[in-house]
Amino acid sequence: KFSKQSWGLENEALIVRCPRQGKSSYIVDWYYSQTNKSIPTQERNRVFASGQLLKFLPAEVADSGIYTCIVRSPTFNRTGYANVTIYKKQPDCNVPDYLMYSTVSGSEKNSKIYCPTIDLYNWTAPLEWFKNCQALQGSRYKAHKSFLVIDNVMTDDAGDYTCKFIHNENGANYSVTATRSFTVKDEQGFSLFPVIRAPAHNETKEVEIGENTNLTCSACFGKGAQFLATVQWQLNGNKITDFSEPRIQQEEGQNQSFSNGLACVNTVLRIADVKEEDLLLRYDCLALNLHGLRRHTIRLSRK
């Protein structure tokens, strides 16, 4: 659980998260386990630590090994291990099993292929996608945010899909690729106009000034796999990305399915160090699928 395998290709960026999670305020120290040597935090180094993240910019085969992260709260120190392996670039198109991320399944209704580990990187759209090393072209393929959507999925769409993107660190660009298998399954399901489970419409949440708070937008879209189902937050009608306030961050939506088969998505809005001006904002939870858009509004009030 607290030893995590990570891998990458030489001359590409690799970013690894400490498998031991803690609050964002906790200090994280990184060490190279074999030598117990501390990993520097200065960004001028090719390999450096940045809080919960260990960055190889770019990675070299010699970086392979076990890295220790120690997360320090005021009273507890907890240890995690990142087992990092950097491989030489493959001369041919074949992607070996040890470079593959988990297999995902899709169906006619839901053909989303998420780009693995991308949330760790500072990247900008669009992603490039390849199937069995061939660049994907044509209107059936849509690169949307961090995933690929395939229209009218057929059995021969199964295969190995590689996403390629650029990580930017202090103005320098580094390439990253990640590959996973996609299988096609037949699935009976249906989609509905989105139903927002939380928050209630026109809800008010009490918060403490100076504390952190989370708002969860949770919506369900039908049964079984869904072709398009997004849940996101808006601030005063603007996208979170357009609202340049680093204290307010939206997590990528987490898929959830319940015992009754409902397909739901949760997206959390994290607000750090709540300020008075946050109480003036309108927070809209938006749920969108092919049937349409539903919006619930929540406001913050001082406790």
Partner: antibody
Framework: EVQLLESGGGLVQPGGSLRLSCAAS????????MIWVRQAPGKGLEWVST????????YYADSVKGRFTISRDNSKNTLYLQMNSLRAEDTAVYYC????????????????WGQGTLVTVSS | EIVLTQSPATLSLSPGERATLSCRAS??????LAWYQQKPGQAPRLLIY???NRATGIPARFSGSGSGTDFTLTISSLEPEDFAVYYC?????????FGQGTKVEIK
Amino acid sequence: EVQLLESGGGLVQPGGSLRLSCAASGFTFSIYDMIWVRQAPGKGLEWVSTIRGEGGSTYYADSVKGRFTISRDNSKNTLYLQMNSLRAEDTAVYYCARDPWSTEGSFFVLDYWGQGTLVTVSS
Amino acid sequence: EIVLTQSPATLSLSPGERATLSCRASQSVDDDLAWYQQKPGQAPRLLIYDASNRATGIPARFSGSGSGTDFTLTISSLEPEDFAVYYCQQYITAPLTFGQGTKVEIK
């Protein structure tokens, strides 16, 4: 100094209700997960319930699910346990305790405990 | 539910002796295991977390080891104040569970 002080215990008849409180001081109560643990006379420790720091997620032992409700009032630095449909087997000392790590989706140890309040269910 | 089984139920030793307490989990808990000490009429006190780390203020004579399903709490040289009941607890998943306890008593 971290302190947890339970109150609200006492003698109650089977089928009755009781509400336990735990007053916290010496730390920023609202950011910590809080827990109720009980100990029947002469027996071991049994986890009862956990509530996340933001007051969102709650977790219950199967033995109390549907009968007990954990809640908190962060403005009053107080943790509660509402106990309904009490049974003889609920007789125990009830402790409130703090989880000092508190990251969503995970659990940790209990670093501070109150001295406990005794609940006796008997006719 | 993960069941924790502690052995022995009672350990009779003299001050200065070494105490070895065992805790076995019904399935792997990685290193998500803690040890507590409880004296009569008192609340439990945290000794060890993450299987082998001593909590703040706990004397060095207490040490924990193990991973997965088999864990050990060792008291290298018993002091008079160490005679108490010791519980292990797993926190890898809910429900959080405790062992039934090992009583360390004066021989």
